[in-house]
């Protein structure tokens, strides 16, 4: 069961896996959640009754019964991992810890104007896990305003001590705030010849890449496939690092694949969720349980529901045996990966889906779309919402996109003359406007947040957030779209679609059925030539056919320009403005969402 509250002055006895240092019990709980085996923890807060060397210790614990005996102890704070919970989990920690020195390898020292600048530096440095900043009140003159970037093998401090006039904090890479490049490519027939920090077994290069991504020290990896000549190294995933942050040597080797940590793009692609099945593959590990199951899908469900299960192997039933049920072997290991992978024994293996909640919901695969045709089908664009105004009468006002369970991203120009958020209604999971009746459920709008530099659509900053009064429960017909990664600024999107209920020609009316059009992106240089009277800035993105014919139009405003990249849909643009609709050599102009990721995160993550 899910227990989120912390138990004050309580210590769990026994079950120790390892001890790390964390600045707070809250962060200890996050570390426990992300650890492959931790189910419970005990944190020791600073206290005069405690030995200072034990302050800030976070003892990660495991238990076959999922609980441990409780003992009263002053300054101890205990709790459970969020593994047992169904809610979305994030490792993002924006907290700044005053008068704490988080120890690690100090590999970079520089002057910074503020702790925020130091944190930004850490976030944009490939090696940095956390930092300590000496404030201008720090006693030692030569250390004032010094920003120390630090890393450790575990990503958590090796020790934490009290130190006046310093502040410490963590890299915000896991908050999607890094400007580091997001390199998704996997390079075939390539070995990166750099130092290995760890090695695990993986069924394919994609899983290896995901493991590298959530390993604190891994910057890139090499994977030896099952056809690799050296049998003992088959399915071996080597996690690597280098001083420069890049591979120093690439060696051409057949049957090996290499790639990079996806740390800078982890909010927009799945890195924890290994959802594939591996046929004719057996995962070896510590056996947790053997249960009968009808199929490998049922076996995966059983593993997902067993909190300690990390991976499984299913052996299909022999004909007419055991009512057609096969054997489902639920397994675990010290690091969450199989200890060995065997092929050719007829098993079907896979991983728990419990970790999927650590990934952004927006990375979930949606149903295959119908190609061709202009009318959408239900569930094809589950992030698309219709924003209605009730003034003078209820009607579709603009489109919008679900980007979080309480947040809609749309265009600022939609709110001209809207005096209050109360008069707005957001409908999600809608295909036809005619579905919306008086009793159709909607989300009320609590707040309209318009970019403070917005003046008019044509001059940019045409972006707004709607904070909903209640949260959206994600389903197949209503779920979020990923924001583009700042590290993806140079990605060339080739599969982009604009959707909306807007006009189909300049003098028309709102369409009943959600319309879709595949539209190519146009370079800003090309777009600028088509709009000589306007300034097309880097904060705008253009899309359209040279000959016209397909475009967004009145009523589509605020809706998404959705682009598919590496099987994940990204909100690349917000429908903003254009000269007429679908005119020859007049592309549509969209708000370039990647340029506003910081603004979006600042507003949506504000306490």
């Amino acid at each position: 069961e899910c227990v989120t509250q912390l138990l004050k002055d309580t210590c769990f006895e026994g079950g120790d896996i390892t001890t790390v240092f964390t600045p707070s019990a809250k962060y200890c709980q996050v570390v426990c959640t992300y650890h492959p085996r931790c189910l419970l923890f005990t944190f020791t807060a600073e206290s005069p009754s405690e030995d200072p060397t034990r302050w800030f210790t976070c003892v990660l614990k495991d238990s076959v019964t999922e609980t441990l005996p409780r003992v009263n102890r002053t300054a101890a704070i205990s709790g459970y991992s969020f593994k047992q919970c169904s809610h979305q989990i994030s490792a993002c920690n924006k907290d700044i810890y005053v008068d704490l020195d988080m120890k690690g390898i100090n590999y970079n020292s520089s002057v910074a104007k503020s702790a925020q600048e130091c944190q930004e530096r850490c976030t944009d440095d490939v090696h940095c896990h956390f930092f300590t900043y000496a404030t201008r009140q720090f006693p030692s003159l030569e250390h004032r305003n010094i920003c120390l970037l630090k890393h450790t093998q575990t990503g958590t401090p090796t020790r934490i001590t009290k130190l006046d006039k310093v502040v410490s904090g963590f890299s915000l890479k896991s908050c999607a705030l890094s400007n580091l490049a997001c390199i998704r490519d996997i390079f075939p027939n390539t070995v990166f010849a750099d130092s290995n920090i760890d090695s695990v077994m993986a069924p394919d290069a994609f899983v290896c890449g995901r493991i590298c991504t959530h390993h604190p020290g891994c910057l890139f990896f090499t994977f030896f496939s099952q056809e690799w000549p050296k049998e003992s190294q088959r399915n071996l995933c080597l996690l690597k690092t280098s001083e420069s942050g890049l591979p120093s040597t690439r060696i051409k080797k057949s049957k090996a694949l290499s790639g990079f940590s996806l740390q800078s793009c982890r909010h927009s692609i799945p890195v924890f969720c290994h959802s594939s099945f591996y046929h004719d593959t057996d995962f070896l590990g510590e056996e947790l349980d053997i249960v009968a199951a009808k199929s490998h899908e049922a076996c995966q469900k059983l593993c997902t529901n067993a909190v300690r299960c990390q991976f499984f192997t299913y052996t299909p039933a022999q004909a007419s045996c055991n009512e057609g049920k096969g054997k489902c072997y639920l397994k675990l290991s010290s690091n969450g990966s199989p200890t060995k992978i065997l092929h050719g024994r007829g098993g079907i293996s896979g991983y728990t889906l419990r970790l999927c909640k650590m990934d952004n919901e927006c990375t979930t695969k949606i149903k295959p779309r119908i190609v061709g045709g202009t009318a959408s089908v239900r569930g094809e664009w589950p992030w698309q919402v219709t924003l209605h105004t009730t003034s003078p009468t209820q009607r579709h006002l603009c489109g919008g996109s679900i980007i979080g369970n309480q947040w809609i991203l749309t265009a600022a120009h939609c709110f001209y003359g809207v005096e209050s958020p109360k008069i707005l209604r957001v409908y999600s999971g809608i295909l036809n406007q005619s579905e919306i009746k008086e009793d159709t459920s909607f989300f009320g709008v609590q707040e309209i947040i318009i970019h403070d530099q917005y003046k008019m659509a044509e001059s940019g900053y045409d972006i707004a957030l709607l904070k909903l009064e209640t949260t959206v429960n994600y389903t197949d017909s209503q779920r979020p779209i990923c924001l583009p990664s700042k590290g993806d600024r140079n990605v060339i999107y080739t599969d982009c679609w604009v959707t909306g209920w807007g006009y189909r020609k300049l003098r028309d009316k709102i369409q009943n059925t959600l319309q879709k059009a595949k539209i190519p992106l146009v370079t800003n240089e090309e777009c600028q030539k088509r709009y000589r009277g306007h300034k097309i800035t880097h904060k705008m993105i253009c899309a359209g056919y040279r000959e016209g014919g397909k475009d967004a139009c009145k009523g589509d405003s605020g809706g998404p320009l959705s682009c598919k990249h590496n099987e994940v849909w990204h909100l690349v643009g917000i429908t903003s403005w254009g000269e007429g609709c679908a005119q020859r050599e007049r592309p549509g102009v969209y708000t370039n969402v990647v340029e506003y990721v910081d603004w979006i995160l600042e507003k949506t993550q504000a306490v």
Partner: antibody, heavy 117, light 107 residues
């Protein structure tokens, strides 16, 4: 069922003010715009303005902007219309009407206001 | 302001007749037009909304059509109880405006 009950007839002198009430029941008062419309003897309908009780957002016809104040009391689900500086041409039946999902679907019975010296 | 011009201002027809009342908007109001029936001494009642949607409980002899600037209310077979004044109104933009009304009588 939805009901809009308006206050009784008023006889006023020119220059005076009048405040009419409209008590709503049978629906969530805060979630619908309340409009006010008047009809002079033998004439058509004339829109005065509207109010959204949940936020006190209002819109007025320019003709009435300086003389009309629309308010709403959510605790009693009552909308009010105050018209000041009355003149003889303000003699009319004043209706409150709820803007339903797409149109003015429920109307009060009307309040007759007579302005005469 | 959008001007709604209703015609005729009055008409007389026999029971069973097909009756048509038109309303012309001075600019495009899409389909944001409603029709109301008002009997003497009573408040108006909604008949048609969204130009062509019959309101709950309204007999199916009443129908509406049109979009843009030209709208029509049709009574397919006039009944004695249909004697009333009929108003069209637009709710496309502020200020909301109404036609001057059409008074319908039985011959």
């Amino acid at each position: 069922q939805v009901q809009l009950v308006q206050s009784g007839s008023e006889l006023k002198k020119p220059g005076a003010s009048v405040k009419l009430s409209c008590k709503a029941s049978g629906y969530t008062f805060t979630r619908y715009w309340m409009h006010w419309v008047r009809q002079a003897p033998g004439q058509g309908l004339e829109w005065i303005g509207n109010i959204y009780p949940d936020s006190d957002s209002t819109n007025y016809d320019e003709k009435f902007r300086t003389r009309v104040t629309l308010t709403a009391d959510t605790s009693t689900s009552t909308a009010y219309m105050e018209l000041s500086s009355l003149r003889s041409e303000d003699t009319a039946v004043y209706y409150c009407t709820r803007m339903g999902f797409y149109a003015m679907d429920y109307w009060g019975q009307g309040t007759t206001v007579t302005v005469s010296s | 302001d959008i001007v709604m011009t209703q015609s005729p201002s009055s008409l007389s027809a026999s029971v069973g007749d097909r009756v048509t009342i038109t309303c012309k908007a001075s600019e495009n109001v899409v389909t944001y037009v409603s029709w109301f029936q008002q009997k003497p001494g009573q408040a108006p009642k909604l008949l048609i909304y969204g130009a062509s949607n019959r309101y709950t409980g309204v007999p199916d002899r009443f129908s509406g059509s049109g979009s843009g600037t030209d709208f029509t209310l049709t009574i397919s077979s006039l009944q004695a109880e249909d004697v009333a004044t009929y108003h069209c109104g637009q709710s496309y933009s502020y200020p909301l405006t109404f036609g001057q009304g059409t008074k319908l009588e039985i011959k």
